[in-house]
Every structure is written in C-alpha cells, then in structure tokens.
C-alpha cells in the first residue's frame, strides 16, 4: 500500500483538491483510499505529460537535448516497475490482504498447507459449528469469558444429534445455561428459558448447569470444569 | 538525429504508457475483486467460511462428521464388530482410523469410550498393519507385543489400546484425509 | 426430590366451576411444560392440555377446548385448571404431570396423585 | 387424533415370567412413545421415554422397542412388586393420546 506513497513524492504531484481526506471504514478503508490514489495518479499523470508536450513544443525549435522525453520514459518505467511488483504482489499472495482482517481475531494462526479456514486452527468442526475443546478447568464464569474472548460463545446443545456427539467426545463439560437462584427458571446465556430436563436441580447451590455421560445436570457455578466454546456458522 | 532520438524516447514512453495503463487496470481489477471478498465477509470470526465450503469440497466434512487439522472422523454411537466397522467405512469412502501420533484424537481426550481402529495382524508380514497396508510404528503402542494376532485393536482418546475378539461390539471411528 | 402436590377431592354442583391445584416442589415450573390428563373407569386415560408456565402458551385437545382452563402462578410454583359448566360427565380423577423434555425424547417422568372431581347435586 | 391400541387388556402371570405389552399407533410415531405403570389406588410413574430410553431409577428388567407405527414393552423375571397397571402414551403430535391400559394380575 505504501507504494503509491511513493509514487507521489517522486511525482511531487498538487493534492487534489477534490479528495477528500477520508477516515477509514471499517477494515476496507484502505483499499478505498489506494483506489482514489491510484485513479488521482493517473489523472495527474496524463496532465503532467501534457505538461511536458506543451514545453517540449515550445522548446523544440531551439534544439535542446530531449530531457522531458528522457524523464518521461524513466518515470513510466519506474510506475510500471511499481506497478508490476503490486499486481505480482496481489495475484501471488491473495491472502495478504485478509492478512489484517483475520489477524483482529484474538486466536492468530499459522495458516497450514491442509487448513482451509472453516475454523481456527485447533478448533473442529461439526455440523456447521465450531467447537474449541478445551483443556483446562474454569468456573462457570471463567468459562463464559473465555469463549467470549475467543469471538464465541459457552457451549449450547441443540438437538440430540448434537448431545450424543458432545456426550461421546467429552462428557463432564460446562454449558451456557444457568439460573440466578432455585427460583427461578433455567435460562441460556442468550436469555431463553431452558426447557430441556436438568438432573439434581432441587439442589439450590446448583445454579450452572453441565454437560455429562447421561444427559445434563446441575452443579455449583464455583466448581472448575473443563469448557468447550462454540460458533455457529 | 535528434528528432530521431525524440520520436524514439516518444515512442519508449508511448509503450511506457500504454503498459502503465493496462498494469493499472489490472491492478484495479485485483484490488476491486480483492475488496468485495472483504466486505462479503463479516468481521473474522472463528466459525468456518461458508464460500469456501460451497465451492471446495476438500475443505468440508460431511454433515455428522468431525473436522479436525487436516481429516474428517465421524465418531460412531453405536456398536459394530470389527468387520462391521470397516465396512461401514468404506461405504463412506473412508478407512477405520488409522493414527498419525498418540494427540491426534486429543480433541475428544475425556472421552471414557474405547474404539475400533484400523489395525490388524497380517499372518503374511507377521506384523500388525494398517487397513493402507504401512507397519504400525513402535512408539504408537508401546505395549503391542503383547497383542494376540487373532484379535482386533481398540483404542481411547487418553492413548490406551486393547486387543479384543474381532467379534466383540464396539463403537468405531472412521476417517477421511482432507489433502 | 421432584413433587407434585395435589388436593385430594372436589364435590361440586352441575354448571358449575372447579379450580384443580398442582404445587411443584424440587423443581421450577417455568422450565418444563405442565400437564392435565383426565381418568374415568370406562373411558381409560384422556389428554386435556399443557401449559408453558414461563409464557402461558397453551395447547389443548379439542374436546376440552371451551371446558377446560389453564393458568400458572410462577410465584408459588403451582399449575392450575379450572373446569367449567360441570356435568356428570365431569366427574373424574384429574392428574397433572410434568412432561419430561430433552432433545428429542419427551414423556411424563412425574405426576401428582390425582384430584377426584366429583360433580353431584 | 392419533389411535393407540394396546393389547393384551390385562393378562395373568406368574412371578418370574417374561411379559411383553403392545401398542399399536394408526399412523407412525417414530419412537415418540412412552410407557406408564399405575400401582392400585396411587398414581402414575414414568418407565419407558422416546420408545427404549429408562426413567432415572427404574429396573433394568423394564425395556421398550420397537419403530415405526408399533411398540412393545417387556418386563423380564417379573417381581411381585411389578404387578399393576400399564399404559402407552404418544406424544409424536397433538392431542397426546393414550392406550386402552394392560392389567397386569398374579397366576
């Protein structure tokens, strides 16, 4: 991106009073402004070799040495030099302009040759989710935090194909599914009700509820488990 | 001689130019497509790029299939004989697991349950091999030698393996390589 | 442990109403469905309808549509239903249940012991 | 509304006997079935849910099977304490609907 800085000093071009400085949108901003730069380049361009027709028609007569032309000719080479290494740059890594975009992501990859971006590295996938599988213990809470630094949320089950797949791959783990006190209803972290049966919820110290080999059960929030996080797709 | 030079550097700069241009437009072709892609996709997210699942099926799994690195495992909840299993697999265009390194399965390591894998003796090669026909390397099991040759292997997630009549039920795991 | 609590009998006159109670205890009633079945010794067991205690979505079978009423009261964990214009033919052991709700599978793990609705002049 | 015949209504057998109990529903219900057991004078307790899955607490010599449109319960080495009242009751759609009942007696 940077390029195009240069091709402005060496160009020494007036700033063009129709450009507005713009503040960057988002992530794409950047590629907004190079596009202005590169259209104003060229504009310029064509007035500066104008420019230089002109004083080459007056001077011509007198027999100077042909200075414009020679300056002309070195700076399209030097552009169309420039130029080349961008579109060389473009077309040989695509990914470099995502590069910025993925990199916000609090779990930075390393892109490897099979890892085709579904999901983070480390992360699987299944039926069109993502899953961290987690090694280390947390409370509820802890757990809930985690998943939210990492761009998802505590695990959630949706239907029994995905209960008997999350029982056989990790059966004691948290889920995003809680209640404030005995009286009050089961809610997921979204707010819903929880409809879904919950074993040993008449124990009032049990207010986190968890994933484990036959179903889910209550437990006290303080108690470290092992947490999954999920993103749906 | 100095007109001469003059249309020469003229015509140097014409070429100059008109490649100037093309180079341009080349350039904001890429950079255009380059930034729709961008604004098409939502601020990064670790959930998988559906484009890319619509148009590379070496990058997806199968529905009810577990993608993991660079393979595809679908985890079995019922029971089948070694038999069984394999050729459960195999109607799946994939083979019963065969292990890279004890972590490969280190996504499902709290699991309780023991699965069929694709390791069999060969009476042939008087050594236990994989269903591709490769030797099953020494540090994988430690305690292989001991395994009968009539029986079948079994293994969990923790990195435990156990010889089992071929016979007995057991859940299974498939796998697929994505490359 | 789950309970449900029932009264144990009702006499009411012909055209009348009768407000049946269900206390929970062991757990919320907001977070499952709340069930009323009726039983007669001739006519075997007859679903009535459930409630969404949390919401008050209700869902009845036809023949108790415009006969039967179903509220909750979240504060004290109890389902109610009320049966209204009482004829003999009212006259039943009324249970509510708790439905059993996981992924898929349903069911009625719990009931109560039953209200004997007895409508006599 | 969706029909459940159960059959047989009662039967008498002797403790240690092998029972099976059926229900036939007038269309398929995919397992959305459950069973129900009702001892005399009290009330009503869960046994089978979703067609084969046992409720917390119940004997292992309780099993359900079966798919499509017809169910059976079975009850191994029959106890004392099993003879009573059997029900099947589906809930693939509503109105939930419930079988005639099995009486289940003592030789």
């Known amino acids: 991106m940077d390029n195009q800085g240069v091709i402005y000093s060496d160009l020494n071009l007036p700033p063009n009073p129709k450009r507005k400085q713009q503040k960057p949108k988002g992530n794409t901003s950047s590629i907004l402004v190079t596009e202005q730069e590169i259209t104003y380049v060229e504009l310029n361009l064509q007035k500066t070799s104008q420019d230089f027709q002109g004083n080459y028609k007056t001077n011509h007569c007198k027999d100077l040495p042909s200075v414009p032309e020679k300056l002309i000719a070195g700076i399209l080479g030097i552009i169309c030099l420039i130029l080349m290494a961008s579109v060389v740059t473009i077309v040989v890594i695509p990914s470099t302009l995502t590069q910025k975009h993925n990199n916000s992501s609090l779990n930075t990859r390393t892109q490897k040759a099979c890892h085709c971006g579904h999901c983070p590295e480390e992360w699987i996938t299944y039926s069109n989710s993502c899953y961290y599988i987690g090694k280390e213990k947390r409370t509820w809470a802890e757990s809930l935090l985690a998943c939210t630094l990492k761009n998802s949320s505590l695990l959630s089950i949706d239907n029994e194909e995905e209960m008997k797949f999350l029982t056989a791959i990790s059966p004691s783990t948290w889920t995003g599914v809680f209640r404030d006190s005995s009286q009050h209803p089961w809610v997921t972290i979204n707010g819903l009700t929880f409809k879904h049966e919950i074993k040993d919820s008449d124990n009032a110290e049990h207010n986190c509820a968890m994933l484990h080999a036959r179903g889910l059960k209550s437990d006290r929030c303080g108690s470290s488990k092992i947490y999954h996080c999920k993103h749906k797709l | 001689m100095a007109v001469f030079k003059t249309t020469l550097w003229r015509l140097i700069s014409g070429t100059l130019g008109i490649i100037c241009l093309s180079l341009m437009a080349t350039l904001g072709i890429l950079l255009k497509n380059s930034f729709t892609k961008l604004s098409v996709e939502p601020a990064y997210t670790p959930g998988p790029n559906i484009e890319l699942q619509k148009d590379s099926d070496c990058c997806s799994c199968h529905e009810k299939w577990v993608g993991y690195r660079c393979n595809c495992y679908f985890i079995s909840s019922e029971e089948k004989t070694w038999n069984e299993s394999r050729h459960f697999c195999a109607s799946q265009k994939s083979s019963l697991l065969q292990l890279q390194n004890r972590d490969e399965l280190d996504f499902m390591s709290s699991s309780q349950h023991f699965y069929w894998i694709g390791l069999s003796y060969s009476e042939e090669h008087t050594a236990w091999l994989w269903e591709n026909g490769s030797a099953l390397s020494q540090y994988l099991f430690p305690s292989f030698e001991t395994f009968k040759p009539k029986n079948c292997i079994a293994y969990n997630s923790k990195g435990n393996a156990l010889d089992e009549s071929c016979e007995t039920k057991n859940r299974y795991i498939c796998k697929q390589q994505l490359i | 442990e789950v309970q449900l609590q029932q009264s144990v009998a009702e006499l009411v006159r012909p055209g009348a109403s009768v407000k049946l109670s269900c206390t929970a205890s062991g757990f919320n009633i907001q977070n499952t469905y709340m069930h009323w079945v009726k039983e007669r010794p001739e006519q075997g067991l007859e679903w009535i309808g459930r409630?969404?205690?949390?919401?008050?979505?209700?869902e009845f079978a036809p023949k108790f549509q415009g006969k039967a009423t179903l509220t909750t009261d979240t504060s004290s964990n109890t389902a109610y239903l009320q049966l209204s214009s009482l004829t003999s033919e009212d006259t039943a052991i009324y249970y509510c249940?708790?439905?059993?709700?996981?992924?898929?599978?349903?069911?009625?793990?719990?009931w109560g012991q039953g209200t004997l609705v007895t409508v006599s002049a | 509304d969706i029909l459940m015949t159960q059959s047989p209504p009662s039967m008498s057998v002797s403790l240690g006997d092998t029972v099976s109990i059926t229900c036939h529903a007038s269309q398929g219900i995919s397992s959305n079935i459950g069973w129900l057991q009702q001892k005399p004078g009290k009330s009503f307790k869960g046994l089978i849910y979703h067609g084969t899955n046992l409720e917390d607490g119940v004997p292992s010599r309780f099993s359900g099977s079966g798919s499509g449109a017809d169910y059976s319960l079975t009850i191994s080495s029959l106890e004392s304490e099993d003879f009573a009242d059997y029900y099947c009751?589906?809930?693939?759609?509503?109105?939930?609907?419930f079988g005639g009942g099995t009486k289940l007696e003592i030789k």
């Open positions: 009751v589906q809930y693939a759609q509503f109105p939930w609907t």
């Open positions: 409630i969404d205690p949390a919401n008050g979505d209700t």
């Open positions: 249940g708790r439905e059993r709700y996981f992924y898929g599978s349903r069911g009625f793990a719990y």
